[in-house]
Amino acid sequence: LIIGFGISGRHSITVTTVASAGNIGEDGILSCTFEPDIKLSDIVIQWLKEGVLGLVHEFKEGKDELSEQDEMFRGRTAVFADQVIVGNASLRLKNVQLTDAGTYKCYIITSKGKGNANLEYKTGAFSMPEVNVDYNASSETLRCEAPRWFPQPTVVWASQVDQGANFSEVSNTSFELNSENVTMKVVSVLYNVTINNTYSCMIENDIAKATGDIKVTESEIKRRSHLQLLNSKAS
């Protein structure tokens, strides 16, 4: 969490941002809140990006003001206009691109004063893994697949029964470049699987960590997966 305060002269207001990550090709949110004002027409929101000389987005007098927007953000940004009055200056960023990563500044002017806070935005690709039993294999084998990751992640297998065991010798992981030539499909195969055990396929890069679990018994197969973004710090 980053909390910024205003500049001297006029009163300062508190602006708060949260570091976040964007999944390339999808929509993302750059979070920013501020001390609200009673009049929408008195609120100015400016989003800036370090190293970019045009604005990312500007909202003033109750509407978007895009005359100074930089070309790289054209048609891809929006604030939640109905929530500005309650202090939400968060920015929706459409079709996140790898080059959107960097340091952003949320700068606010209200009748109470000015304030700003920085936000670190990471971009990459991350997706839920799915673990299945590979019935085509000669021995009991598990196959963990996740369609989109970037940068290249690490893949680690774990088991509930053999806690702390190193499965690197009995697993094989491959990365296949997707058609857009940035993200990759992750496929990891685990051999010599025993029944009545829960196995976890953990995929992690510097942006996200995802886990796919599979419980294999004689009577059923249960699956579960979850994904967690890393480094979500508020400012």
Epitope: L53, L66, E71
Partner: antibody, heavy 116, light 107 residues
Amino acid sequence: QVQLVQSGAEVKKPGASVKVSCKASGYTFTDYYMNWVRQAPGQGLEWMGRVNPANGGTNYAQKFQGRVTLTVDTSTSTAYMELSSLRSEDTAVYYCARRHNYADFWGQGTTVTVSS
Amino acid sequence: DIQMTQSPSSLSASVGDRVTITCRASQDISNYLNWYQQKPGKAPKLLIYYTSRLHSGVPSRFSGSGSGTDYTLTISSLQPEDFATYFCQQGQTLPWTFGQGTKLEIK
């Protein structure tokens, strides 16, 4: 007040290179993109590219890619445009112009004549 | 690249006349349309940016309008100093592209 002052006229032979300078004053040099636009005699305006003085990042028009190099010297608030492998069609007035989306201030222009 | 088509290419008018120059883009440019005035031997000067915003120091007889692909520069009452060449330019995407120019001459 904002001023962009360009270097003087140049006469070059085909195949040579030319480097034109544009010295900025009256504003913070690293706050605005610097564009380069050229105009052949009696013709329209043609955007060549731009440089970000804050980090040296460049964007070039496809037509000039590989032949033009845009650089800056932040210590002297000066932008440079170097055009190589000159041909007669490069005879034109070359302008530097500030900002993104539109050009609010322009240099006075530098005439480059390419002749054997 | 976005193509900009300006019309007319030349225009004769008298002092006091109302004059209109149009510019058409090959695709929607979302109001990122700018107008410049250029006199012989001089650099272009910005008149209007973002379709209708007057650059500082530009007389109010100049105005701009339009949206999507079609834009217009209007001079409400021509003054002797307005006889020049006018260019439109799109700033929606790189590379910037310009119209071929409209030469405004004295009738």
